[in-house]
Structure formats: structure tokens, C-alpha cells
Amino acid sequence: EDELQVIQPEKSVSVAAGESATLRCAMTSLIPVGPIMWFRGAGAGRELIYNQKEGHFPRVTTVSELTKRNNLDFSISISNITPADAGTYYCVKFRKGSPDDVEFKSGAGTELSVRAKPSAPVVSGPAVRATPEHTVSFTCESHGFSPRDITLKWFKNGNELSDFQTNVDPAGDSVSYSIHSTARVVLTRGDVHSQVICEIAHITLQGDPLRGTANLSEAIRVPPTLEVTQQPMRAENQANVTCQVSNFYPRGLQLTWLENGNVSRTETASTLIENKDGTYNWMSWLLVNTCAHRDDVVLTCQVEHDGQQAVSKSYALEISAHQKEHGSDITHEAALAPTAPLGGSG
């Protein structure tokens, strides 16, 4: 009889993670007597996958009934494939022997590659907020995919970005891979409602890419603009001064009124007007009893926004000569009025 040949007809097999992989092997003869074994890898470090003779291999089933004498098919099926199962599998015929069976002949090997989907991309932004015209970095990460080929794109509000750097690790062969990308985005005042999107395309996704998003609202701080104005009053001994705080984001804002440098009142913004671009407006007003002042008064609206250094705007309130003459007879009494909102500036 011709000497036994071990035939592994497929050089490579590709399987999606979670599926079963069938590795085909046939013998041309049953001589010599001895078991068939399957290994992953070659050489001293090879891993036993199946031994016809003995052992418990819960994920492995034989495609044919190996106890039938005329059976020359020694194909196996491995269930629930994961990326860790990737490698080259060898079907090996042993000759019965002692103290160990003797390797008689090996098949050429079948390379099993595992197609594994990338994890949902996770996009994270900067740790601290930045103001418009500054550049911030966003990162996108996805893991566990195979094969290595992958495409990553960045978008801002549907427009593709070009300023980004992407790495796929590891550089060499691996059971699965990770991707890490950093995009640089220039902030604009209108970015409160903007989104950045990381889009990943991979062979396992069948043309339906995965997307991860981040809101620029988490990354941006739009500082307020202040305007202090005096409103007309019927009573000549009262002045109504308003501080219009406009186009700021995020909400957190504390306002302090100072009269000639002395704190008159501090309040925290609560009822805000939201603009179409996502920024907020707020107005505070101060009712000043002009009779309490002999001289002109400098009113300062001081705003601390989002924990940043305070910004301020001052207004010089003129005290008329008539009021100055009678001022000494009037008890110093500044009436502080409650705040009132001002209509939004679309």
C-alpha cells in the first residue's frame, strides 16, 4: 500500500467570532495503527486541540464518526470561536507506541483567522473646557477587532475632519487589535450644539459603520459679554441700573454688584434665557436710592463664570446737584430690587 498521506485541503479558513469553525482533514489510509491529533501551532510549544485517543475537548466535535473503520475523514468542528482561537491548525497522524505515541505524519496546516467586530467606539473630550478659537483634542477608542484592516473617520456636524492621528495596535500579528485616534477641533462660539462623531468601518460590520459621539457642549466655555445700562425711572431719587449678561455657556454664573468698590449684593443666576445657539442670557438689576449719595457713584457688575476669573463692567451714576444739596438730610439707603429677565437675543 502507498504510505499514508494527511490532507488538509484548505490553506486558510475565516470565521466570525461566535460561530463554529470546521477544519478539514483526510487520511489516505488507516495504516499505521495509532491516533489522530489536532494541534494549534507547530514545534515544542504547540497546543493540543483534540486527541482521538483520550481527553475531554468540550468545544471540539468530529465531523464524521471516527469509530467507523472505513472512515478516513478526521475533520473537526470547534464551537464558539473567539479571536484567541486564531492560528494555524495541524492534523497529525501518530503511530501507536510507548512510552509515547510517535508522530508519523502531519498535514500542511490550515490557518484559522477570526473576524471579530470592533467594540462600540468611545469618544472622550478634553478634561477642561476651552474657549472659542482654541483647539481641543478628542479621542476615539475601539477594541477587540480582527482582522487588522480598519477605517476611522472624524466628523463635526456632518463635515469630515482632517486634523487627526490614528494608531492601530499592536503593530505585529495578534489575535485582535485596538484603534486609538485623536482629533483636533477648533472651537467656535456656535459650538454649544455641535457634535463630533468618530466613525469606524470594518469588514465585520457589513457596510454599517459604528459611531461614537461627543458633544462639544462638554468641551466649550463661552465667556459672557457684559453691558451695564441705566433704565429711566419716574421717581427722580431712584436709579435703575441693569447688567445684561449675554451669550455665555455653561450655566454656572455668579454676579456681584459693587457700589464704589463695596459689595452691594451677590446672586447666582437661576432663571436663564437660552439662545438658539445654546448660549444663555441673564439680566440683573439694581435699584439705587440716589438720595443716599452725595457724590457720583460707580456701579460695577462683576461676573464670575464657570469658576473662571471674574470679569466686570462699570457704570458711573451721576448724582445731580439738587440731590447733592439734600443728600445730607437723607439716610443712606440703597434699595436693591430683585432681578428681572431680559428678552433673549436670538
Epitope: E1, I31, V33, E54, K68, N70, N71, K96, P99, D100
Partner: antibody
Framework: EVQLVESGGGLVQPGGSLRLSCAAS????????MHWVRQATGKGLEWVSA???????YYTGSVKGRFTISRENAKNSLYLQMNSLRASDTAVYYC????????????WGQGTMVTVSS | DIQMTQSPSSLSASVGDRVTITCRAS??????LAWFQQKPGKAPKSLIY???SLHSGVPSKFSGSGSGTDFTLTISSLQPEDFATYYC?????????FGQGTKLEIK
Amino acid sequence: EVQLVESGGGLVQPGGSLRLSCAASGFTLSSYDMHWVRQATGKGLEWVSAIGTAGDTYYTGSVKGRFTISRENAKNSLYLQMNSLRASDTAVYYCVRGGVWDDAFDIWGQGTMVTVSS
Amino acid sequence: DIQMTQSPSSLSASVGDRVTITCRASQDINNYLAWFQQKPGKAPKSLIYTASSLHSGVPSKFSGSGSGTDFTLTISSLQPEDFATYYCQQYVSYPYTFGQGTKLEIK
């Protein structure tokens, strides 16, 4: 049903000959290694001879040159030609099938008695 | 030739007992060891191959273990039909050889 049935045993004088037959049913005999095992009355089991699927033959030392194992594929039968028989060859002879990949004995015949006596 | 030695040669036990028979090879036989059961006037019956694998139809109360030179056959709970003679056999190389047998008797 897989079955082995031996025949051809009997009483023979020392120096005489006998041919044992084993008829296989339920499987193709030529696809398996086949064996003869014997057991003297009140004694243990002794392996006698084997024939491989390639026609290779094997014997225990005490029968070498006297016994010949063979098979006839057309009749799906195994044979043991015993010549120059001795009193020590007296035993029940069993036909046995070897297992698929390791030749472990799996199917036994019921046996046939060979008595060598003058 | 490889010598196979069984112990004990005979053993008395009661129904329900757990019994162990040992078999030693004169040289390493890997795990190519078989166990057979034989009742008076009957052909042997194959129980175990490759030291621990049960032949089809053999009840799980029979179990085998060992590798190299030392092997055991265990019957977990003896039933009346289990009283018989048990043989071990090496089949790693020709000539295949049997142990001398262990006769299991009712106490």
C-alpha cells in the same frame, strides 16, 4: 448485527493439522486488524496471531512457523491454519476484531475447541 | 515480551462493595491497556480500552485509570452479575500479552 462465528475445531492427534474459520457479519473484515486468542481449560487468555489490513501477519513465539493466519475477503472470513499441533495447543480458540484506530479488541467470537491428543 | 502482572489473583467481596484490581506492566505501555470480563463457559467481554475509555454499552460503574506501567480497574458498586474473572491486556506492541487474571468471588 456485528458478529464473529468460529468453526473448524475438534480432536486432532499430535503432529496433525487443523484449519479454523471465522465468519464475520455486520462489517467488512478486511477493513480491520483481526486476531486469534486462545484459552486452555482453567487457564488464562493467550494472544496467538494477528493479520493487519495491509496483510501483515504477527505470531506469538510458540506458534511461529507452525500456524498461518489468512483471510478471504470475498467470503468475509478469517482463517488459522494450524500444523504440527502439540498437546500444549489444546484450547478454546477465539476470533477477535481489533478496534478502529488503536487495535483494542472490541468484538469476540464464541470460540471453538481444539483438542490435541493421541 | 512485555509481562503483565495482576493483583490480587482472587478477591472475595460482597454485593454493593467497591473493588479495585491492579495491573502492572514490565515496561512502559503508554496507555494501551484493555480490561476484559469473562464468565465461566463464555467468551471474554471487552470493558475498557486505552486504560480509561469504556466500550459501548459498558455501565459506568466500571472505570479504569493509569498510564505507563501501573493501571487499575474499579467497580464502584458490585452487583451479582459482576462476579467473574477480569483480565488486563497490553496492546502497544506484538506479541500482545494478558495478565494472569483476577477471580472476583462472592463473599
